[in-house]
């Protein structure tokens, strides 16, 4: 029978034994930085080339015996998960192993850096097809390890790493915290986050997605035909490395940004039981379990977007938080969120020639998050139009006035400490959907984009307050680019996109004791690209 | 590792040379910073990654490493360059006393220095 984990990553509507992957990963080389491996294991024999790279610290303790089977255990298992004959994800992928972890599974940041440098030099000496680098390891936050990963990613290499097995915020670990790296948490057969002994999978905004990581049967170094169960975020990362290899083999020109967006797009959504995560991390942690695409064609026409959360701003009066998109993504909208509700909104601003999303804390606030909506929009020309606070009581409004530009997102930013106490509330006039509106005390920022065939529409959903959460989703074929709340209530904590749904959160009125005026209204901007659809049809 | 930790007889107590003129002052207003692992048991004091500014060439990295060795030797400290980085990040890996960090942070081209730390199979 097919192992549960391979069944789980098979696209819906297929059985794992019926699914014919578009390609087994044969055009892709996967580098594994790990322990030594047993390359003559039946699962991986002829599939893994052991490089001469080795940089490991001495084993601790006097009683430690270097048994080959023990030294090879972790790496052999992962090589099997990526490309094993029977239990592997990408059965056609070829692998190269570098030894950066000793027999106890311990390495150093410096040894890992030298390993990454070795890969870069190999890539320069003998350029091959797409490269995937699997880093099934974690240490404390390291500026230099993250920087090296960034450089390698910008050289066109896809890096996949383990989120870590510490039941903690993945942002406190490296390389998990490097934004350019695809960071993978672990789930089990029940789609629960994995408990690992006394700890468990890491979580939080630095995790990109989850994948099977409990009771994963793979090659055992105990003998050349043995199998064993291992569990952890390394196993989860190995699944994603295998999926990435298959996607890249089918579409070798995919950029890292395109690959990441596809991994997110084809993931199973909202299947993880979030109660396992600490309460303050639930909204930040992606509810995504990796899966293979049903087919490679038909993905190209999609307008892909993802949500990127900033780090927490901290509680000081003037604190801000910044969320950034990857270099080849467009920032199409910007929103903010504060658990206390005390915030001064958000704005899109240029930084180093690129738009970023900045959220502003307010006096007495516990801090804010900035939330960027990052999309793949080829040949896009996007700009931000700002309207300063209005003099008139009608409120502030701004629209996209350039020919061919469409509204993709609305942001508002204000200097007054508690906007809700300033009346009157402003509601947007009907029949003018292509504009952003806000309180008269707020600056309003419209994200306006021109791209071939891009069209957008506004969807609203309002519910009479008090209401803790209001959502509005884009329909099939449309992608959520913008998510905001209509002005009119003082209780809004913020707005953010979850997959294709805009979520507006309000204060729990039972705890604040006050009652809200008006309704809580979530506003979604839904876009699609006819140009991408046409290009995709021409390819087929 | 390229050089075993115990090979102190290979360490050269560098003589004063043209490398050991006064350190070029770092660019005005940009102070190099020091970083170390927040998890104490994972720290590996005594080994440091010296990261140089982005456009630094290999020859400058080697020169900076030699300058550090020379200045350390003048103060009676042994140092050992374990690896010179190029291709991804400019810089070098050095085995030295933590007492030399202040000196190293003042070297030309230095962006930041990070104490080595452990990573673990997950």
């Amino acid at each position: 029978s097919i192992p549960w984990n391979l069944e789980r990553i098979t696209p819906p509507r297929y059985r794992a034994d019926e699914y014919q992957p578009p390609d087994g990963g044969s055009l892709v080389e996967v580098y594994l930085l790990d322990t030594s491996i047993q390359s003559d294991h039946r699962e991986i024999e002829g599939r893994v080339m052991v490089t001469d790279f080795e940089n490991v610290p001495e084993e601790d303790g006097t009683r430690f015996h270097r048994q080959a089977s023990k030294c090879d255990s972790h790496g052999t298992h992962l090589a099997g998960v990526v490309s094993g004959r029977d239990a592997g994800v990408a059965k056609g992928a070829s692998m190269r192993s570098l030894r950066v972890l000793n027999c106890q599974g311990k390495g150093t940041v410096s040894g890992t850096l030298i390993g990454l440098e070795f890969i870069r030099k190999s890539q320069l000496v003998q350029p091959v097809g797409p490269l995937v680098v699997l880093l099934p390891l974690a240490g404390g936050y390291s500026r230099v390890l993250n920087a090296a990963c960034q450089r390698l990613a910008r050289a066109g290499v896809v890096l996949v790493t383990a989120a870590g097995n510490f039941r903690d915020d993945a942002c406190l670990y490296s390389p998990a915290s490097a934004p350019e790296v695809i960071t993978v948490g672990a789930t089990n057969a029940q789609d629960q986050p994995v408990t690992l002994g006394t700890l468990g999978t890491n979580f939080g905004r630095c995790v990109d997605l989850f994948a099977p990581g409990e009771d994963i049967i793979g090659a055992s170094s105990y003998c050349s035909t043995c199998f064993v169960s291992q569990s952890g975020t390394s196993q989860a990362a190995a699944h994603v490395a295998g999926i990435a290899a298959m996607m890249l083999s089918a579409e070798p020109e995919l950029t890292l940004a395109e690959l990441r967006q596809r991994l997110i797009h084809f993931s199973a959504k909202d299947v993880i039981n979030e109660a396992w995560f600490p309460e303050d991390q639930r909204v930040l942690t992606p509810n995504l379990v990796a899966a293979l695409p049903p087919s490679t064609h038909g993905a190209g026409w999609q307008l892909f977007c993802r949500t990127v959360w900033s780090a927490h701003s901290g509680p000081t009066r003037m604190a801000t938080a910044v969320a950034r998109c990857a270099p080849d993504e467009e920032l199409l909208s910007c929103s903010s969120f504060s658990r206390s509700g005390k915030r001064r909104g958000e704005r899109m601003e240029a930084q180093g020639g690129k738009l970023v999303c900045r959220a502003h804390n307010a006096f007495g606030g516990e801090g804010v998050y900035a939330i960027a909506r990052c999309c793949l929009l080829p040949q896009a020309n996007c700009s931000v139009h700002t309207a300063p606070p209005a003099e008139a009581s009608m409120g502030t409004r701004v629209h996209c006035h350039q020919q061919g530009h469409v509204l993709t997102g609305c942001s508002s930013h204000w200097e007054v400490e508690d906007l809700g106490t300033h009346k009157p509330p402003v509601l947007r006039p009907r029949g003018q959907p292509n504009q952003c509106v806000g309180h008269r005390e707020a600056s309003i920022h419209a994200s306006c984009c021109h791209a071939p065939g891009l069209e957008c529409k506004v969807k609203e959903h309002g519910i009479p307050a008090p209401q803790e959460q209001v959502t509005v989703a884009c329909e099939e074929g449309w992608t959520l680019t913008g998510c905001s709340a209509l002005p009119g209530t003082s209780h809004v904590l913020g707005a953010y996109a979850v997959d294709n749904t805009c979520v507006v959160r309000s204060r729990d009125v039972s705890t604040t004791g006050s009652t809200s005026e008006g309704a809580v209204t979530a506003v979604a901007i839904c876009c699609r690209s006819r140009h991408l659809a046409q290009a995709s049809q021409e390819l087929q | 590792q390229e050089d075993e930790d115990g090979d102190y007889e290979e360490l050269v107590l560098a003589l004063r040379s043209e490398e050991d003129g006064l350190a070029e002052a770092p660019e005005h207003g940009t102070t190099a910073t020091f970083h170390r692992c927040a998890k104490d048991p994972w720290r590996l004091p005594g080994t440091y990654v010296v990261v140089l500014k982005e456009e630094t060439h290999l020859s400058q990295s080697e020169r900076t490493a030699r300058r550090l060795q020379a200045q350390a030797a003048r103060r009676g400290y042994l140092t050992k360059i374990l690896h010179v980085f190029h291709g991804l990040l400019p810089g070098f890996l050095v085995k030295m006393s933590g007492d030399l960090l202040e000196l190293a942070l003042k070297l030309p081209h230095v962006d930041y220095i990070e104490e080595d730390s452990s990573v673990f199979a997950q």
């Epitope: 029978s1 006394t198 009771d215 569990s231 | -």
Partner: antibody
């Protein structure tokens, strides 16, 4: 979904051999992470773990001290089931007998590799066995 | 053998009550402990594994805590369907042992 179905006689004569079968569906007796257990429950003894069998490139057994020497647990890979045999039974062996699965895995962290066992998660329906002539 | 001492052996409680059951191991067992619920004529059903992790599908009113030698099962607000017998199981070594059980009855 793993399911364990028990079968076997409800009455055994003293000094005879008690034989029970546990059929596995939705899993494999040869699994590289599972172990297959027998447990019994009686008013006098409460819940008592008897033993387990598991495959890790070869077959291994662990038996409770209280029944060691009288107990045998064996697999049948062709039928995907496992058996309990308890020899020389006495009325003291009257109990409800359960089969159950546990499973273990290797987990890595900053202290290296550790075997971790997840305990008994799936149980059979139980078989009441009376030892009496 | 590791001995597991469970207390109390029985307790009476009302719907809505907070109930706490304790298991003490004769030696340290890390967090290698599970909690089981058994109703008359049925097989035991696992509620908690790894001392504190909730089994999938089990209501969140059940929680487990402890490590080493002292372990606790808590039912935050007792429901009518929770009246049953509860057992702990240690699986730290290869010879496993159960607690003697706690019967939770309606007051």
């Amino acid at each position: 979904q793993l399911n364990l179905q028990q079968s076997g006689p409800g009455l055994v004569n003293p000094s005879q051999t008690l034989s029970l079968t546990c059929a596995i569906s939705g899993g494999s007796v040869s699994s590289n992470s599972a172990a297959w257990n027998w447990i019994r429950q009686s008013p006098s003894r409460g819940l008592e773990w008897l033993g387990r069998i598991y495959s890790r490139s070869k077959w291994y057994h662990d038996y409770a001290v209280s029944v060691k020497g009288r107990i045998t647990i064996n697999p049948d890979t062709s039928k995907n089931q496992f058996f309990l045999q308890l020899n020389s039974v006495t009325p003291e062996d009257t109990a409800v007998y359960y089969c159950a699965r546990d499973w273990e895995t290797i987990i890595w962290g900053d202290d290296g590799p550790n075997y971790y066992n997840y305990g008994l998660d799936v149980w059979g329906q139980g078989t009441t066995v009376t030892v009496s002539s | 053998d590791i001995q597991m001492t469970q207390s109390p052996s029985s307790l009476s409680a009302s719907v809505g009550d907070r109930v706490t059951i304790t298991c003490r191991a004769s030696q340290g067992i890390r967090n290698d402990l599970g909690w089981y619920q058994q109703k008359p004529g049925k097989a035991p059903k696992r509620l908690i594994y790894g001392a504190s992790s909730l089994q999938s599908g089990v209501p969140s009113r059940f929680s487990g805590s402890g490590s080493g030698t002292e372990f606790t099962l808590t039912i935050s607000s007792l429901q009518p369907e929770d009246f049953a017998t509860y057992y702990c199981l240690q699986h730290n070594n290869y010879l496993w042992t159960f607690g003697q059980g706690t019967k939770v009855e309606i007051k």
